[in-house]
């Protein structure tokens, strides 16, 4: 079988500060089993955005039904944007494992923010 | 404190349709997907159907998929399973569960009995 | 199915362990208490390896590859109970359980 892939569709997003930014992940397989974990960045300052298995996260959503039992889709939306949010967010797929293992990233999709209309 | 409440268990016949319901406070009910678990008298527990957290998706195992249908009313905080056909091996308590982001169970009701008698 | 032993038995203060095999690498273990039969189950360990906030320390749990380990460290009476494991197969959506473990505390 084909190893799994994280599907990144989207170089690049821009938003207007203030409203949502929405970001597109898919993964195309289910195997290996495992989180998916979103960051702001890389190496090892990146900093955790969303982590499917844990944590709070307020003001991030999961676009799609992330309860169904096939989903391998791990789009997330961002509320109330602000220029801090710019950066470049990588989807990124675990192993489960104790600890879990970074399993495979997506290439990152540029956020950047644009000044509120007026 | 999450609480979860089963009712509608009974004594019915071979043949019969019965529905069962789960009761749900303490946490965000639409968020989460939920299970029922039965436990026939003197045997070990078996996964009977899921559902994700909308009520889209529906699951179950083989014993009991062609005759019964899991659903559920976010706006009441209410699982439901309606099980038709019955017969004596349906005989169980039904247990309502809590699905962890993995599929898993967090937390369990009290359970409802259906005897399946002529 | 998932395979436990059917037995084990310890006394007060020993370290306990016990195995569930045959899910495969393809799925995540959780283990459940259940103190009589036909009584809600409890929760002792879900992921493998996460313990609710409201399960004692002695309980924990671990996998490697396709077995699930659930260690009760320093067993007490009150721990007699069937212990089920139970696992989510990311192949065929089920969920599965093994036949349940029932420990004697001597």
């Known amino acids: 079988e084909e190893e799994l892939q994280v599907i990144q569709p989207d170089k690049s997003v821009s938003v207007a500060a203030g409203e949502s930014a929405i970001l597109h992940c898919t993964v195309t397989s289910l195997i290996p089993v495992g989180p998916i974990q979103w960051f702001r960045g890389a190496g090892p300052a990146r900093e955790l955005i969303y982590n499917q298995k844990e944590g709070h996260f307020p003001r991030v959503t999961t676009v799609s039904e992330s309860t169904k039992r096939e989903n391998m889709d791990f789009s997330i939306s961002i509320s109330n944007i602000t220029p801090a949010d710019a950066g470049t967010y990588y989807c990124v797929k675990f192993r489960k494992g104790s600890p879990d293992t970074e399993f495979k990233s997506g290439a990152g999709t540029e956020l950047s923010v644009r000044a509120k209309p007026s | 404190d999450v609480q979860l409440v089963e009712s509608g268990g009974a004594v019915v016949r071979p043949g019969e349709t019965l529905r069962l319901s789960c009761t749900a406070s303490?946490?965000?009910?639409?968020?989460?997907?939920m299970s029922w678990v039965r436990q026939a008298p003197g045997k070990g527990l078996e996964w009977v159907s899921g559902i994700s957290a909308s009520g889209s998706d529906t699951y179950y195992a083989d014993s009991v998929k062609g005759r019964s249908t899991i659903s559920r009313d976010n706006s009441k905080n209410t699982l439901y399973l309606r099980m038709s056909s019955l017969t004596a091996e349906d005989t169980a308590v039904y247990y309502c569960?809590?699905?962890?982001?993995?599929?898993?169970?967090?937390?369990w009701g009290l359970g409802t009995l259906v005897t399946v008698s002529s | 199915a998932l395979t436990q032993p059917a037995s084990v038995s310890a006394n007060p203060g020993e370290t306990v362990k016990i195995t569930c095999s045959g899910g495969?690498?393809?799925?995540?273990y959780g283990w459940y208490q259940q103190k009589s039969p036909g009584s809600a189950p409890v929760t002792l360990i879900?992921?493998?390896?996460k313990r609710p906030s409201d399960i004692p320390s002695r309980f924990s749990g671990s996998a490697s590859g396709s077995t699930a380990t659930l260690t009760i460290t320093g067993v007490q009476v009150e721990d007699e109970a069937v212990y089920y494991c139970g696992g989510y197969d990311y192949t065929t959506y089920v969920n599965t359980f093994g036949a349940g473990t029932t420990l004697t505390v001597l």
């Open positions: 879900h992921s493998d390896d």
């Open positions: 303490g946490f965000t009910f639409s968020s989460y997907a």
């Open positions: 569960a809590r699905e962890t982001w993995n599929h898993l169970f967090d937390y």
């Open positions: 495969g690498t393809s799925s995540y």
